[in-house]
Structures are given as structure tokens and as C-alpha cells.
């Protein structure tokens, strides 16, 4: 059918609660395109009727709620004027046993989000809530080891739990709960978070510094091989991840099928006060679709990008 297949990373989800996935793949979805969702290679599109438990909402697929039998491979087909891309998303649904007040047991959060708080600092946790505009998200409550979090040190602000003067006792199993309202019906979203504590020292304000790139464009010929280093300085005992992303997805996942663009192995040089890290991105063959797209180097909270640009024509 002339559609290019793209395979996204697996999503592992909790049953009996809402879930949504947005079909975005720039630069494809940045222009005039139509998006249609399908399940398990079915020729029949996912319903667009908002009363349906599973339906398409603009570019999103929305499950209200997700159920055990919803596991499978979902495809979204993005059709442009001159292009067609089929994105495959593998959704795995499992039963999650959260705190049952009658049992009083702790939730098993090992497979849920993992977040870090920094000892002695003011820090925060995030409740990740990704839903279309049609979903109104209500007040968020936070729990630690099944008890609602209260106290002067904790402030619930939007999707975050601000924690002042983090202590070792703040490690543990957390959950954030939000009420989602859609078409007059209410649903509960409950996300588990495993929190660990780190003693990161301060270097340059304890924010990793990206030496290169510097948010700039690189002129490169079509079809050539290109390797770009991301150089980062950070504290010796930092816990930051360094990686290359495109469209907020790891490049290795984004180009999982073709492996045309890959992230290299991280190396580092140790200095007295800090480490210098290098992680590269390799374009085995630069294609037209790579131009104008920001390839982001992430280092903790720091980001910097490169944008590939066609060289100006030489009229000599």
C-alpha cells in the first residue's frame, strides 16, 4: 500500500484506568496530514465516536478505560499529500494491584516510573499525565506507601509534588492520583513512582553543561555519513542520563527498524572536579527527512540541538 513502516517502543500499561497515545512523528505530522488509528492490522479504523470506550480523538487513541483484552499492536497511518507512514505501537496491558485499603498492602511499583530526588535540596516529582484536550484532569493527590502525603515540606503544584529539603526518608513507593473527566464521565488515573535519593554535589549550579552542540545548524550533503558528538560536563557523582532524542524519543527507538541513525557508546574523561562525557549520534546516510528536524542532546535537565541543513548551492 506504499506506506513506510515505523516501529515505536513498547508501552506497558495498567488495566482499569484511562490511557492515551498521541500519533506524532515530525516532520510528517507538522504539515497537512490525516491520521487514522487501527488495531492489529485490521482494515477497520478505530471508532471516532466519543462514547466508544476505545476511540480516536484527533491524533490520539484514547482508552476509557484500558482493559486486559486491549493488549496488541496498534497502527496509526499518517497520510500526507505525497507520503504515507504507518507507525506501530505495541501496547501491553497488565493488572496492577495498587493499595487496597482492605488489605493495606504496598503497591508493586518496580515497573512504573522511576524518579530521583536530590538529598538536602528542594526538588520535585512529576505525575505524568498525557491525554488529549477533551480530557479534563482534576485535582491530583499524592501518596507515599499508601498514605496521602501532607506536611509543610510537600506542596502539590500542578502535576508536581514539590519536596523541600529532601531527606533519606523520602525514598520509597509513591503514587499520584488524578480524576479524569471525559464527556461527563469520571475516571481515576493512578501512576506509581519508585523514588530513590541521590547525593549529587554541585558543579556549575548542579546542572550539566552541554559544551557542544550549541543549538545550531550543520550543513551536510544528502546521502553522506555524519557523526556529531555531544560533549557534557557534570559532577563526578551525578546520576544524569545523557542521550540523543528526536521528537522526544530516543533515536535508537525512533529508528529502531532501519537503524540508520544510532546513538554511540558514552565515554568520559575524569577531571579533578568534574567529568567530561561524550555521546555521539551517527547518521549512516543523511536523508531528506532529516533536514530541519531538531536532534536533541539531553543531559539531565540540559538540552541542546543540532539541525541538519542542505548546503547552499555553489553557483561558481
Amino acid at each position: 500500500d506504499g506506506c513506510k513502516d515505523i516501529f515505536m517502543k513498547n508501552e506497558i500499561l495498567s488495566a482499569s484506568q484511562p490511557f492515551a497515545f498521541n500519533c506524532t512523528f515530525p516532520p510528517i505530522t507538522s504539515g497537512e496530514v490525516s491520521v487514522t488509528w487501527y488495531k492489529n492490522s485490521s482494515k477497520i479504523p478505530v471508532s471516532k465516536i466519543i462514547q466508544s470506550r476505545i476511540h480516536q480523538d484527533e491524533t490520539w487513541i484514547l482508552f476509557l478505560p484500558m482493559e486486559w483484552g486491549d493488549s496488541g499492536v496498534y497502527q496509526c497511518v499518517i497520510k500526507g499529500r505525497d507520503s504515507c507512514h504507518r507507525i506501530h505501537v505495541n501496547l501491553t496491558v497488565f493488572e496492577k494491584h495498587w493499595c487496597d485499603t482492605s488489605i493495606g498492602g504496598l503497591p508493586n511499583l518496580s515497573d512504573e516510573y522511576k524518579q530521583i530526588l536530590h538529598l538536602g535540596k528542594d526538588d520535585s516529582l512529576t505525575c505524568h499525565l498525557h491525554f488529549p484536550k477533551s480530557c479534563v484532569l482534576g485535582p491530583i493527590k499524592w501518596y507515599k506507601d499508601c498514605n496521602e502525603i501532607k506536611g509543610e515540606r510537600f506542596t502539590v503544584l500542578e502535576t508536581r509534588l514539590l519536596v523541600s529539603n529532601v531527606s533519606a526518608e523520602d525514598r520509597g513507593n509513591y503514587a499520584c492520583q488524578a480524576i479524569l473527566t471525559h464527556s461527563g464521565k469520571q475516571y481515576e488515573v493512578l501512576n506509581g513512582i519508585t523514588v530513590s535519593i541521590t547525593e549529587r554535589a554541585g558543579y556549575g549550579g548542579s546542572v550539566p553543561k552541554i559544551i557542544y552542540p550549541k543549538n545550531h545548524s550543520i550543513e551536510v550533503q544528502l546521502g553522506t555519513t555524519l557523526i556529531v558528538d555531544c560533549n557534557v560536563t557534570d559532577t563526578k557523582d551525578n546520576t544524569n542520563l545523557r542521550c540523543w532524542r528526536v521528537n522526544n524519543t530516543l533515536v535508537d527507538d525512533y529508528y529502531d527498524e532501519s537503524k540508520r541513525i544510532r546513538e554511540g557508546v558514552e565515554t568520559h574523561v575524569s577531571f579533578r572536579e568534574h567529568n567530561l562525557y561524550t555521546v555521539n549520534i551517527t547518521f549512516l546516510e543523511v536523508k531528506m527527512e532529516d533536514y530541519g528536524l531538531p536532534f536533541m542532546c539531553h543531559a539531565g535537565v540540559s538540552t541542546a540541538y543540532i539541525i541538519l541543513q542542505l548546503p547552499a548551492p555553489d553557483f561558481r
Epitope: 491530583i140 546542572v207 535537565v301
Partner: antibody
């Protein structure tokens, strides 16, 4: 629609206290923080603190921690901000403000402002 | 406290021309969750402030699309593609990454 209506202008003497009210309507009062921001004449904006009607939780800018008290009357969906030991530099317009939504920050809703003049 | 520094202090613009205001924060406002906790407000004469941009680049409800926000973790820009007479007032940047919430000193925009 969301509306925040504040009490009228006040003139106070140095050392006195002032209590400004902010009556909320058009949303579930107990779901949102109510923020207080002040603006001295020809000056910028200064965040004083915020109050959550559920559990009477207050988070204050340290600059005001000894002088500001925030309270509420749930029956009338009203939040109060009391500033004590007034000095001339407290002369300002005091605003109450509410965030865009429960998960998106930024003050999308503001009261009309209450001018407090401190003068001997 | 996070310090927000705005430039310029004032700006005089011809209607229909573009305008740009800058703001710098003393700490990166880009959170680990990939959200940048940065905002732009406009206070028109005699009115309370109004939200223009939230989370660095999102247009608030009812704000004309001639306004746009961009930036990195510490350096931010508000652009008006074509200034109109109704855009006069004082523009403030703000952060809510952490408490206390802080505002920039303001940039006064007037029409030539």
C-alpha cells in the same frame, strides 16, 4: 465562567492591619490554590503566597511569613489575605489570582485588584 | 530565589512592525519532566495582568497568534510578529519551577 471579585480600596495607618477578600465563582473552590500578588505604584509584580482551601494549606514567600495570614470561608467561596504591621512600602494594589487549570500553571484568572494605601 | 531579568526596560514600536522582549532566569527552568516552567504576562494600563504564554511556548486561551514564546532553559524570548495598538502595556516574565514564584521587572511597550 471563572470570576474573582475583590473587596474595595482601603486606607490604613502604619502599624495597622488590612484584610482583603477575594470571592470566587464559576469553579470548584476547593480544588485550586488561590495566589496573592501585589504591585506597588509604578513597580513590578511580587508573589506573596498561596492558599489551598482544602486543609487550609498556606505557602508564603519568606518575605511575608511573619506578617501574612490567609484564611477562607468555604460557604461563600471566599479567601482572605491579612497583612499586619503595615508600613508605607506596603502601599500597593493587591491581586488574587488562580491558575489556568489544575495541571497547567500560569495565572489565567485575576481579581480586579484592591488598592491598599498606608499613610499616616 | 530564582531571579528573572528582563531586557529591554522599555520598547517603542511602529504598528505593524515586529517586536521582541527577552528574559533570563538565574536557574534553568527546564524540569526533568521536559516542561519549562516559564510564563509571559501582559498588563495593560489600569488592568490586572493577563496570561499570554504558558510553559514557555504555549499560547494561552484567547491570545492572538501574533504572539509567540521560545527559549532554552534560562534564556527566553517573546515575539510579536506585527505589533498592534492594543499590545501596549508592561510585559512580565515569570517562573513557577519552585517557590517563591518570581516575576521579571517588566518591559514597557509603547507605540511610536
Amino acid at each position: 465562567q471563572v470570576q474573582l471579585v475583590q473587596s474595595g480600596a482601603e486606607v490604613k495607618k502604619p502599624g495597622a492591619s488590612v484584610k482583603v477578600s477575594c470571592k470566587a465563582s464559576g469553579y470548584t473552590f476547593t480544588n485550586y490554590w488561590m495566589n496573592w500578588v501585589r504591585q506597588a505604584p509604578r513597580q513590578g509584580l511580587e508573589w506573596m503566597g498561596m492558599f489551598h482551601p482544602t486543609g487550609d494549606v498556606t505557602r508564603l514567600n519568606q518575605k511575608f511569613k511573619d506578617r501574612v495570614t490567609m484564611t477562607r470561608d468555604t460557604s461563600t467561596s471566599t479567601v482572605y489575605m491579612e497583612l499586619s504591621s503595615l508600613r508605607s512600602e506596603d502601599t500597593a494594589v493587591y491581586y488574587c489570582a488562580r491558575t489556568t487549570s489544575m495541571i497547567i500553571g500560569g495565572f489565567a484568572y485575576w481579581g480586579q485588584g484592591t488598592l491598599v494605601t498606608v499613610s499616616s | 530565589d530564582i531571579v528573572m531579568t528582563q531586557t529591554p526596560l522599555s520598547l517603542s514600536v511602529t504598528p505593524g512592525q515586529p517586536a521582541s522582549i527577552s528574559c533570563r532566569s538565574s536557574k534553568s527552568l527546564l524540569h526533568r519532566n521536559a516542561i519549562t516552567y516559564f510564563y509571559w504576562y501582559l498588563q495593560k494600563p489600569g488592568q490586572p495582568p493577563q496570561l499570554l504564554i504558558y510553559q514557555m511556548s504555549n499560547l494561552a486561551s484567547g491570545v492572538p497568534d501574533r504572539f509567540s514564546g521560545s527559549g532554552s532553559g534560562t534564556d527566553f524570548t517573546l515575539k510579536i510578529s506585527r505589533v498592534e495598538a492594543e499590545d501596549v502595556g508592561v510585559y512580565y516574565c515569570a517562573q513557577n519551577l519552585e517557590l517563591p514564584l518570581t516575576f521579571g521587572g517588566g518591559t514597557k511597550v509603547e507605540i511610536k
